[in-house]
């Protein structure tokens, strides 16, 4: 029994002075409790408490469950305990069947012994089950056995407390091990689509799903920048025991321009957070936007393939989309695709082939696109780059002579004099006069020039070259001159070809 | 890390009595189970008995029971195996081992983590 100094409050003595007590089943238990200030006698076993206000504690006839710590305590809230066992070979444990384990804790299967003379007081599994290898315990007769450091792959793990009597082993009622697993990650958490986009009106509802090992996750949609509570709705599985998952879907109704913003889906657990946003952007009405992938001024060499590509975002979807040249309407050779496959794409590629072109196929090509709220359009200037061609060479009736030649760009009429026999042209001429004439065809096409030389100046035989030449390409033609006399003689002109 | 050290040992005629203690040293505050196993000769390590620290419970096979008990001094941090009615096949090196908790299969020695030298014991006819 305790011993104090004296003039300090002591703790209550108890008699039997003893620690443990053992009875057996049917004998009497008869506790007393000495102190001036007795105020209580408390039993405990498992999660029964009872009370009594007598200094002597007295049971007549014990029973099992009278297994269990006594404990007198003084008005000074000193106290004292006693743990009695009552030995009863029919019913060697007490139990409290419920059993939940938190993993990696520890945990009580609380099966206290009436009788702690017996042995081999340990676990074992169900209908001969083996039990986990690595499942370690501490055994306390006073109150279970504690599981050590429970693993997840515990649980629904089937168990008897098991004491050996007279040489067999007896086993308590079954406990079910419930494990409550410990997060060891953030939760996972995943959006239905990064980013919505719609009129105002419309409906906005995502789903955020969140997925951890329990349903104790904790998740919400915010809004950022703003404190205000969105209302969501959710719904949840358990796909097998350690698989939960939820899915949180926020609704606007009628969303508004004002709505747009950033939407968060926010989850922690006691390992951590993890969010995933939303983008939300509210339009009053639709809308079409067309970016060139070329330059809308497109310049491109006869006989050549050139490909007039635009993209453009359309929200709602496009529903038409044409390509135009010369009030016609191409039936083919274009094709239009979304840039993405992905659901919320709105952006879009037309793309217009041209081949071969002439260098009559130059001009103005449109593409068109319209959707339910608006129409756009936007336009290329095609520019066919072809080698000059002479269109005319003669001798005026003034003695001048004239060179009309056509091509894209504008061509340089070059004159050139050739004495004698000589092949090579290189004496150049000035010409009197050079003019660029209106062309008859559509804009876009050749550019017409006209230059003039006086043939007076020449007073040898020999030959003229009227030379036409761009970026393209160049072209000559020639003027044959013979004196015979005082007369000179126009051979008839003949253009050769200069690549 | 917790040191153990068996000692008590020798020669006994067949009939007699031996007690073993097992000294732990260390850190034993944190180690409950505590138990002793022997090996004779060419033969497995077999487990003999058993003893909670905290507790109090016992464990034997039943093999043993009735002639070996385990007892514990929490002073001296000392368990002892009294060993009553020898006979020759009880000779073999005693080990004694210990844990910071008892394996669910107590009496596999492979789940035990601290290890005595061992103190052979020798039963004669």
């Known amino acids: 029994q305790p011993s104090v100094s004296p003039g300090e409050p002591s703790p209550p003595s108890i008699h039997p002075g003893k620690s443990d007590l053992i009875v057996r089943v049917g004998d009497e238990i008869r506790l007393l409790c000495t102190d001036p200030g007795f105020v209580k006698w408390t039993f405990e076993i498992l999660d029964e408490t009872n009370e009594n206000k007598q200094n002597e504690w007295i049971t007549e006839k014990a029973e099992a469950t009278n297994t269990g710590k006594y404990t007198c305590t003084n008005k000074h809230g000193l106290s004292n305990s006693i743990y009695v066992f009552v030995r009863d070979p029919a019913k060697l444990f007490l139990v409290d069947r419920s059993l939940y384990g938190k993993e990696d804790n520890d945990t009580l299967v609380r099966c206290p012994l009436t009788d702690p003379e017996v042995t081999n007081y340990s676990l074992k599994g169900c209908q001969g089950k083996p039990l986990p290898k690595d499942l370690r315990f501490i055994p306390d007769p006073k109150a279970g056995i504690m599981i050590k450091s429970v693993k997840r792959a515990y649980h629904r793990l089937c168990l008897h407390c098991s004491v050996d009597q007279e040489g067999k082993s007896v086993l308590s009622e079954k406990f079910i091990l419930k494990v409550r697993p410990a997060f060891k990650a953030v939760p996972v958490v995943s959006v239905s689509k990064a980013s919505y986009l719609l009129r105002e009106g419309e409906e906005f509802t995502v789903t955020c799903t969140i997925k951890d090992v329990s349903s104790s996750v904790y998740s919400t949609w915010k809004r950022e920048n703003s404190q205000t509570k969105l209302q969501e709705k959710y719904n949840s599985w358990h796909h097998g025991d350690f698989n939960y998952e939820r899915q949180a879907t926020l609704t606007i109704s009628s969303a508004r321009v004002n709505d747009s913003g950033v939407f968060m889906c926010y989850a922690n657990n006691t390992f951590g957070s993890a969010n995933v946003t939303t983008t939300l952007e509210v339009v009053d009405k639709g809308f079409i936007n067309i970016f060139p992938m070329i330059n809308t001024t497109v310049f491109v060499n006869d006989g050549e393939n050139v490909d007039l590509i635009v993209e453009y975002e359309a929200f709602p979807k496009p529903e038409h989309q044409q390509w135009i040249y010369m009030n016609r309407t191409f039936t083919d050779k274009w094709e239009d695709y979304p840039k993405s496959e992905n659901e919320s794409n709105i952006r879009y590629v037309s793309e217009l082939h041209l081949t071969r072109l002439k260098g009559t196929e130059g001009g103005t090509y449109t593409f068109l696109v319209s959707n339910s709220d608006v129409n756009a359009a936007i336009a290329f200037n095609v520019y066919v780059n072809t080698k000059p061609e002479i269109l005319t060479y003669d001798r005026l009736v003034n003695g001048m002579l004239q060179c009309v030649a056509a091509g894209f760009p504008e061509p340089t009429i070059d004159w050139y004099f050739c004495p004698g026999t000589e092949q090579r042209c290189s004496a150049s001429v000035l010409p009197v006069d050079v003019q660029t004439l209106n062309s008859s065809g559509p804009p876009f096409g050749k550019l017409v020039v006209q230059s003039s030389i006086d043939s007076s100046a020449f007073k040898h035989n020999g030959t003229v070259e009227c030379k036409a030449y761009n970026d393209v390409g160049k072209t000559s033609a020639y003027f044959n001159f013979a004196f015979k006399g005082n007369n000179k003689e126009q051979i008839h002109p003949h253009t050769l070809f200069t690549p | 890390e917790v040191q153990l050290v068996e000692s008590g040992g020798g020669l006994v005629r067949a009939g007699g009595s031996l007690r073993l203690s097992c000294a732990a040293s260390?850190?034993?505050?944190?180690?409950?189970?505590r138990a002793w196993f022997r090996q004779a000769p060419g033969k497995e390590r077999e487990f003999v008995a058993a003893?909670?620290?905290?507790?109090?419970?016992?464990y034997y096979p039943n093999s043993m029971k009735g002639r070996f008990t385990i007892s514990r001094d929490n002073a001296k941090n000392t368990v002892y195996l009294q060993m009553n009615s020898l006979k020759p096949e009880d000779t073999a090196v005693y080990y004694c081992?210990?844990?910071?908790?008892?394996?669910?299969?107590?009496?596999?020695?492979?789940?035990?983590?601290?290890w005595g030298q061992g103190t052979l014991v020798t039963v004669s006819s």
């Open positions: 003893i909670s620290w905290s507790g109090g419970s016992t």
């Open positions: 081992a210990a844990d910071e908790s008892f394996p669910a299969y107590y009496s596999d020695y492979a789940l035990y983590r601290y």
């Open positions: 260390g850190r034993t505050f944190t180690y409950d189970a």
